[in-house]
Amino acid sequence: AGHLEQPQISSTKTLSKTARLECVVSGITISATSVYWYRERPGEVIQFLVSISYDGTVRKESGIPSGKFEVDRIPETSTSTLTIHNVEKQDIATYYCALWEV
């Protein structure tokens, strides 16, 4: 079974800068899985943000504008990355990655 680790406990960024979060997949080939990213803002329910499927197809939450969140995967390091562009106060949250094993 696959296992996920998010090595960064926290990330502090200056407004308008870029934040890059990592999710390391082990126990399964990352290219054979779909990785999902979610966020939980303080006092709010968890929300889907973006996913990258086993075939590389990216899907985003329909209500979030293109160019805000960028997802990628690096097979060599078995890592999925979530890039948050133009960080602002609305981005303060806990971010989670999840795995769907195909």
């Epitope: 990216v58 899907r59 329909s62 504008p65 293109s66 160019g67 960028e70």
Partner: antibody, heavy 118, light 108 residues
């Protein structure tokens, strides 16, 4: 039928203001992020502004920052672009555009023409 | 800002021929965030390709996209009369979202 219909374009003098509207139908407008894209006569496409479904994220091109304001009214299925301090270089067809779950711009309105001239 | 450069500016071909359009980006763009659009005179653009290689709904299979990094290509395998138009690439990986300057495919 999925449709976006823009209105509000016209002739305005430099320094003037204009408010564009876009009415959406055929899809659940309230859950989609929306955009304005413009095209100057005989030129290419230029992204202008984006707004999230709940209006918590708003992004603008540097060329319009401080002058244009994007907004939406989900109850009316409508998107707006308030354009102030208009310049000759703002002359263009303005398109209302939906971005889809894959991130690309999948639904475009027919556009409304804005002409800035004295 | 990511700058997209399309070439050639104009492509003069005959119906039935193969068209190869290039889009180069000033910074590396994940293939998931590159799209292609077709625009005919007096009409709004129409989405052809998203994610570099996936055809949008209703787009015929003579249109195909490929590429990664900074080099992307739109190929029209056999030009039909209705394919003569202007084609734009777009990156939507980060704001500001940017378009290429366009390639006009016209009849030779």
């Amino acid at each position: 039928e999925v449709q976006l219909v823009e209105s509000g374009g016209g002739l305005v003098k430099p320094g003037g203001s204009l408010r564009l509207s876009c009415e959406a139908s055929g899809f659940t407008f309230s859950i989609n992020s929306m955009n304005w894209v413009r095209q100057a006569p005989g030129k290419g496409l230029e992204w202008v502004s984006s707004i999230s479904s709940t209006s918590d994220y708003i992004f603008n091109a540097d060329s319009v920052k401080g002058r244009f304001t994007i907004s939406r009214d989900n109850a009316k299925n409508s998107l707006y672009l308030q354009m102030n301090s208009l310049r000759a270089e703002d002359t263009a067809v303005y398109y209302c555009v939906r971005d889809d779950v894959f991130g690309a711009f999948d639904i475009w309105g027919q556009g409304t023409m804005v002409t800035v001239s004295s | 800002e990511i700058v997209l450069t399309q070439s050639p500016g104009t492509l003069s071909l005959s119906p039935g021929e193969r068209a190869t359009l290039s889009c180069r980006t000033s910074q590396s763009v994940s293939r998931s965030y590159l799209g292609w659009y077709q625009q005919k005179p007096g009409q709004p653009p129409r989405l052809l390709i998203f994610g570099s290689s996936s055809r949008a709904t209703g787009i015929p299979d003579r249109f195909s996209g490929s590429g990664s990094g900074t080099d992307f290509t739109l190929t029209i395998s056999r030009l039909e009369p209705e394919d003569f138009a202007v084609y734009y690439c777009q990156q939507y990986s980060r704001s500001p979202l940017t378009f290429g300057g366009g390639t006009k495919v016209d009849i030779k």
